[in-house]
């Protein structure tokens, strides 16, 4: 009954891979490999990932689960989805905050911190693009306000107020009284 190495696993069903002497069935997501199978085409001994650890994919080789990430409170991150045996914690920003990447080439795994979204209303501006993946994009001044420097200034309520050219263009109707 000598064994010979076979370059591929001739086992019924999918997901068998050579682990040492034998072709073994791997472990499902959320489980780690405690011990490989002990016979051809056998089941490996797989155990559920302990609390606060996970494995997202079926695997033949992971003898321990990955530790769940902790969201960085100092970066104002919050857990959008808690860690499970099959998925890592999904960290993000709470409503009214947006993700500011800490590296120039930003990908999903890049480090980030959360910034409060601009409140266009408080700046007396129209909201052109709501804040989610990036900061709020504010538009032109709300009615009754005109552009002055970097901000929006309230139209004068009486003719006594000085009204520069841009003010007159927006608030001109007020000057007639």
């Amino acid at each position: 009954q000598g064994g010979t190495r076979s370059p591929r696993c001739d086992c019924a069903g999918d997901f068998h891979k050579k682990i040492g002497l034998f072709c073994c069935r791997g472990c499902p997501a959320g489980h780690y490999l405690k011990a490989p199978c002990t016979e051809p085409c056998g089941n490996s001994t797989c155990l559920v990932c302990p609390q606060d650890t996970f494995l997202a994919w079926e695997n033949h080789h992971n003898s321990e689960c990955a530790r769940c990430q902790a969201c960085d409170e100092q970066a104002s991150q919050v857990a959008l989805e808690n860690c499970s045996a099959v998925a890592d914690t999904r960290c993000g920003c709470k409503p009214g905050w947006f993700v500011e990447c800490q590296v120039s080439q930003c990908v999903s795994s890049s480090p980030f911190y959360c910034q409060p979204c601009l409140d266009c209303g408080a700046l007396h501006r129209h909201t052109r693009l709501l804040c989610s993946r990036r900061d709020t994009d504010c538009g032109t001044c709300l009615p009754g306000f005109y552009e002055h420097g970097d901000g929006c200034v309230s139209c004068p309520t009486s003719t006594l107020g000085s009204c520069p050219e841009r003010c007159a263009a927006v608030c001109g109707w007020r000057q007639m009284f």
Epitope: G2, G20, L21, T38
Partner: antibody
Framework: EVQLVESGGGSVQPGGSLRLSCAAS????????MSWIRQAPGKGLEWISY????????YYADSVKGRFTISRDNAKNSLYLQMNSLRAEDTAVYYC?????????WGQGTLVTVSS | DIVMTQSPSSLSASVGDRVTITCQAS??????LSWYQQKPGKAPKLLIS???NLETGIPSRFSGSGSGTDFTFTISSLQPEDIATYYC?????????FGQGTRLEIK
């Protein structure tokens, strides 16, 4: 603590028989493949037999095939090696070891001497 | 059968030396290779599995590398308690086979 304790060794004449036992404790015996490995005096290690966790698959080195039989009793946490038609060249310390390839735990060994 | 050729068969080194043992397989064994330490009158002890995976509780001065047919075992700084015989072993294919051993002694 994982422990493997061999017994049953001794002196026997050529052509004789011996049955070695290996008592396992400290782990789930029924989940592991087990092997017998021997070492002749002053020589290297030689794997001689393997049995799967269920006992359904057994393998032997050519040097012992047809003469030795490996078996196990998972209810008793025990591994066995029945050795028949013993020869002088079977003289060695016999170790039982846990694993399906890489042997992470070994017993202390039992000496088998085949001599007339 | 896969033949495992270990070299050297014996070596003498001083405490603190870097010691290297090589093991060559007669055919590709991927990374299915273990290293064992055996002291006189004792059972072998598993040090490294899967060519480079240091077993729990084994000091970090021991390391292994290689894949395919050529493998290396290294002790980065030899200690007096490392005096022993070291064996490589393949578990890619039955029958499982061992190298002939390397006897390590202190100068």
């Amino acid at each position: 603590e994982v422990q493997l304790v061999e017994s049953g060794g001794g002196s026997v004449q050529p052509g004789g028989s011996l049955r070695l036992s290996c008592a396992a404790s400290g782990f789930t015996f029924s989940s592991y493949g087990m092997s017998w490995i021997r070492q002749a005096p002053g020589k290297g290690l030689e794997w001689i037999s393997y049995i799967s966790s269920s006992g359904g698959h057994t393998y032997y080195a050519d040097s012992v095939k047809g003469r030795f039989t490996i078996s196990r009793d998972n209810a008793k946490n025990s591994l066995y090696l029945q050795m028949n038609s013993l020869r002088a060249e079977d003289t060695a310390v016999y170790y039982c070891a846990r694993g399906s390839g890489s042997f992470d735990y070994w017993g202390q060994g039992t000496l088998v001497t085949v001599s007339s | 059968d896969i033949v495992m050729t270990q070299s050297p068969s014996s070596l003498s080194a001083s405490v603190g030396d870097r010691v290297t043992i090589t093991c060559q397989a007669s055919q590709d064994i991927t990374n299915y290779l273990s290293w064992y330490q055996q002291k006189p009158g004792k059972a072998p002890k598993l040090l490294i599995s899967d060519a480079s995976n240091l077993e729990t509780g084994i000091p970090s001065r021991f390391s292994g590398s290689g894949s395919g047919t050529d493998f290396t075992f290294t002790i980065s700084s030899l200690q007096p308690e490392d005096i022993a015989t070291y064996y490589c072993q393949q578990y890619d294919t039955l029958p499982i086979t061992f190298g002939q051993g390397t006897r390590l002694e202190i100068k």
